[in-house]
């Protein structure tokens, strides 16, 4: 829990947060997500790095893999085969993009306590996973997929056409990884391991982004990534399914694309196995307002996959793009044909619907002026989901159970009253058949993870309560946080304000706006954090505000889709509107207002600084987008359409930071970017800098050599130290 205000007599023992606290991660918290292996058992890595199996029902635990074994191969991760005979140990982790990495894998045989010798796995492997039953292995090596019946067997090579930067089998290319699948893998086992589905991405015709990686050598090397920017040629995707018992019988069979999708450029968006012989694929038109869910069945006689038109379900948006950030995925019920899915209702709120035959006949399961966010699990009699319904705070998350076995279905909030002050933002992790579940509370108080009975919802035990963190915070003067809303011209702007510990409404404080503001994002959340802005409030006496304006999520389609085809307009307007309202509150020094953001937030902060309002004295943009023509097709076109004359080229041109170069003349601007940013290319900041120089506008800049979009490691310390100096100088705060 957040320490309450202490009496003055104790106040001298309290200290403010320091920048060092933040950079050292002194006040970071832990969460506990059980690695479920059955209805009542889970694995967990203990503090001393043993892999321990816990049985909830017997209360017993035992070590299945010792830290000694882990250490013998420098393992940083593990995976138990479903038949519990083998464990893979992962070492030599080497990060690639956001989700992807390569690693070396060793297989440990639990029956004899030895590593499997003979037919060892090649290295490095791009992805590896066990089948859901038994101990088959699928893995991706050099962009090709391999299968092993058992770990000691020789592999069966499923694909042969894999080529670096050209053909990707079983793993996504850059754009699918970052903007569509949000995973490092693109292969999926059927529930009993009979079939393996996989995607093949052909990037042959995609333009390549090339940037220098300076390293330590005499000559820098060039990184080349097939990266489709807005309007460019996209990857060509195909989905195949192979019988893993008889993989050479007919080989991989391609799953047909629905005709209405295949008629023009399209994306594959996700694959969900229903049974061993039924699979559900989701497709999306390149113009991302039409999505098709296609249910396909295995034809034993032809050894092919049949996707009848009667099993195609269309989801179309007339006011924006399909879905939220991504199109939602279905959760199938036990009849293996009907499913539950979140999509917009007639009032424009995302809710759970039950689809039995057609989308038109869908039965709405939840409703109201709030949104269902995630379906966690569907059992025979219950559906567990999260929403922000409780007390009408969009930045909260509670877990609900709907009984689907009875009529009418009854709804119960599982989390709303558990630790009401401490916990308002939950996620959950369920065991098989939802026999048990873990709740992970992220705040606003100190995070806590608990274990619960899936039938009674009774708390069984605390898994992690962050006691050390609670004790460490006892003598820290934390800032106060409040979450409130502004009503402006029929728009609700929720904001979070972080106030100095001794905040006094009669005084004037410098204000820093922290902005992200990207479509379908949410910054105003009831979560715990001790971070850089906590320090700025605690030690430097700043007020920090985060505002969710138009384009942000979980408050209905009207707010979400307001930015459709017009990025860079309303997001900026709403930040400015909020600042004006904050000034009216009387405690903001209007001569000391700054704005900062990263990525999309860097774009918004740059546009806000260049808005010509005179509101902002200074601001920072970290790794900003500067023109939507420079960013990835899948993301950009979802919200902006195509940069063509007959589509939306005009707004692409109007919404650049460069077009506003003149307006930076009256603000202090700090522009920051990593030179090896694979995501928002350094090109974006290079073009801003060029435009500012051409306009003879002074500005400050910092680049981070060989750093990507995350600016990690030592760069993080340098970055926050540098930004702190900049802000203190801007606000005339002494060092």
């Amino acid at each position: 829990l957040r320490p309450s205000r202490v009496h003055n007599s104790e106040e001298n023992t309290m200290r403010a947060l320091t920048l060092k606290d933040i950079l050292n991660g002194t006040f970071s918290y832990k969460t506990f997500f059980p690695n479920w292996i059955s209805g009542q058992e889970y694995l967990h890595q203990s503090a001393d790095n043993n892999i321990v199996l816990y049985n909830i029902e017997t209360g017993q635990s035992y070590t299945i893999l010792s830290n000694r074994t882990m250490k013998s191969v420098n393992a940083s991760n593990y995976g138990l085969s479903p038949d519990r005979q083998f464990v893979y140990l992962e070492s030599d982790y080497s990060k690639l993009w956001r989700y992807s990495y390569t690693a070396t894998y060793y297989i440990y045989d639990l029956s004899n306590g030895e590593f499997v010798r003979g037919n060892e796995l090649p290295r490095p492997i791009q992805y590896l996973c066990w089948s859901p039953v038994g101990s088959k292995l699928a893995y991706v090596y050099q962009n090709n997929i391999y299968l092993k019946q058992r770990p000691g067997d020789p592999p069966f090579q499923i694909t042969f056409n894999g080529r670096e930067n050209k053909i990707f089998n079983g793993i996504p290319d850059w754009v699918y990884e970052e903007e569509m699948l949000a995973t490092k893998y693109a292969l999926w086992w059927s529930p009993n391991g009979k079939f393996l589905a996989y995607a093949e991405f052909n990037d042959t015709d995609i333009p390549v982004i090339a940037y220098s990686y300076y390293g330590d050598e005499q000559y820098p090397r060039t990184i080349n990534i097939p990266y489709p920017k807005a309007g460019a040629k996209n990857p060509v995707v195909r989905i195949f399914i192979i019988d893993t018992t008889y993989p050479a019988y007919v080989g991989p069979q391609e799953v047909p694309v629905p005709a209405m999708i295949a008629s023009s450029d399209y994306y594959f968006s996700w694959l969900t196995w229903v049974t061993d012989e039924r699979v559900c694929l989701q497709w999306l038109k390149r113009v991302q307002n039409v999505s098709v869910l296609s249910i396909c069945d295995f034809r034993e006689d032809w050894q092919t996959w049949d996707c009848p038109k009667t099993q195609e379900h269309i989801e179309e948006s007339r006011t924006g793009w399909a879905g939220g950030f991504f199109v939602s995925t279905p959760v199938f019920s036990y009849d293996a044909i009907s499913y539950y899915k979140i999509f917009s209702d007639k009032d424009g709120y995302k809710h759970i619907h039950y689809i039995k035959d057609t989308v038109e006949n869908a039965i709405q399961i939840t409703s109201g002026k709030w949104e269902a966010i995630n379906i966690f699990r569907v059992t025979q009699d219950s559906l567990f989901y999260s929403s922000n319904e409780f007390e009408e705070y969009p930045g909260r998350r509670n877990i609900y159970r709907i009984s689907i076995g009875s009529y009418p279905p009854s709804k119960k909030c599982v989390t709303c009253h558990l630790r009401k002050e401490r916990c308002q933002y939950y996620t959950a992790s369920f065991s098989d058949y939802a026999k048990y579940y873990a709740l992970v509370c992220y705040g606003p108080g100190i995070p806590i993870s608990t274990l619960h009975d899936g039938r009674t919802d009774q708390e069984i035990k605390i898994l992690e309560e962050n006691k050390e963190l609670e004790n460490a915070l006892k003598n820290i003067q934390l800032p106060k946080e409040e979450i409130k809303k502004l009503e402006v011209d029929e728009i609700t702007l929720w904001y979070k304000m972080i106030l100095p510990p001794q905040f006094d409404r009669s005084k004037k404080y410098p204000l820093l706006i922290q902005v992200y503001g990207g479509p379908c994002s949410q910054s105003v959340r009831s979560v715990f954090a001790v971070n850089w802005i906590s320090y700025l409030a605690s030690k430097e006496g700043m007020v920090i505000a985060l505002v969710d304006g138009r384009g942000t999520a979980f408050q209905g389609d009207k707010l979400l889709y307001a930015v459709y085809r017009k990025l860079g307009v309303y997001e900026v307007e709403d930040q400015i509107t909020a600042v004006r309202k904050f000034i009216e509150m009387g405690f903001i020094d209007e001569k000391r207002i700054a704005i900062w953001g990263w990525s999309y937030g860097g774009y918004v902060s740059s546009l806000a600084l260049a808005s010509g309002t005179g509101l902002f004295k200074c601001g920072i943009a970290v790794a900003p987008v500067s023109s939507w023509e420079y960013y990835a097709s899948v993301y950009t076109e979802r919200f902006m359409g195509l940069p063509t004359k007959d589509d939306n080229l005009e707004h692409y041109k109007n919404s650049t930071v460069m077009a506003r170069a003149e307006y930076f003349r009256n603000v202090d601007y700090l522009l920051i970017h990593g030179t090896a940013d694979d995501n928002v290319h350094f090109q974006n900041s290079a073009q801003i800098a060029k435009a500012l120089v051409n306009a003879q506008v002074d500005f400050q800049a910092m680049w981070y050599s060989d750093q990507n979009h995350g600016l990690s490691g030592l760069s993080t310390n340098h970055l926050y130290t540098h930004m702190t100096h900049f802000l203190k100088q801007c606000f005339s705060l002494s060092d």
């Epitope: 038994g134 019946q149 020789p154 069966f156 042969f160 018992t245 008889y246 993989p247 019988y249 080989g251």
Partner: antibody
Framework: EVQLVESGGGLVQPGGSLRLSCAAS????????MSWVRQAPGKGLEWVSW????????GYADSVKGRFTISRDNSKNTLYLQMNSLRAEDTAVYYC???????????WGQGTLVTVSS | DIQMTQSPSSLSASVGDRVTITCRAS??????LNWYQQKPGKAPKLLIY???SLQSGVPSRFSGSGSGTDFTLTISSLQPEDFATYYC?????????FGQGTKVEIK
């Protein structure tokens, strides 16, 4: 280590029947396709039959179709070949082999000789 | 059924020789081609699977190549224990067929 041991071979008259067995050990028998391959004296190898891991799916060479039946008992880790209506040309050493991925024979038994003669 | 034709049917070679055996399929079998060694009175032994992959425990002097219809088994330096009969085998459509064999004899 993987071991396959055939038994049940012998001398049988044309038209007669014989049941071969293959006892498997050293691997998870229930997870693999198993097969019979034969070799007539002084001749090459000829595939006879295979059976899927679960036992429901089978395949036969045209030369034995309708006369031979392959089966397995996963609880006993044993593969069988029921041979009916035997002919002189069925005389061969019969090998039990694991048919990995339905593609290659990675482990073989030592073989059992079946002689069909009057 | 797919027919497999091996050549030569027999060959004489000396220890240290490089030996090449070819196998041709009557239609394309991708890379689903395997090679076996059989010594008199013994069961066959897998040498090469999937056209070019060396089975665990097999000496590296054995190698395989090819795809589609034409395949080769090469013994880079023939050893005394390599005198045996060699068979190629395919298994498309779950109908395995063997070549007629190549007998490698001492010259």
């Amino acid at each position: 280590e993987v071991q396959l041991v055939e038994s049940g071979g012998g001398l049988v008259q044309p038209g007669g029947s014989l049941r071969l067995s293959c006892a498997a050990s050293g691997f998870t028998f229930r997870g693999y396709i198993m097969s019979w391959v034969r070799q007539a004296p002084g001749k090459g190898l000829e595939w006879v039959s295979w059976i899927g891991p679960e036992g429901s799916r089978t395949g036969y060479a045209d030369s034995v179709k309708g006369r031979f039946t392959i089966s397995r008992d996963n609880s006993k880790n044993t593969l069988y070949l029921q041979m009916n209506s035997l002919r002189a040309e069925d005389t061969a050493v019969y090998y039990c082999a694991r048919l990995l991925y339905g593609t290659w024979f990675d482990y073989w038994g030592q073989g059992t000789l079946v002689t069909v003669s009057s | 059924d797919i027919q497999m034709t091996q050549s030569p049917s027999s060959l004489s070679a000396s220890v240290g020789d490089r030996v090449t055996i070819t196998c041709r399929a009557s239609q394309s079998i991708s890379s689903y081609l395997n090679w076996y060694q059989q010594k008199p009175g013994k069961a066959p032994k897998l040498l090469i699977y999937a056209a070019s992959s060396l089975q665990s425990g097999v000496p590296s002097r054995f190698s395989g190549s090819g795809s589609g219809t034409d395949f080769t088994l090469t013994i880079s330096s023939l050893q005394p224990e390599d005198f045996a009969t060699y068979y190629c085998q395919q298994a498309t459509l779950l109908l395995p067929t063997f070549g007629q064999g190549t007998k490698v004899e001492i010259k």
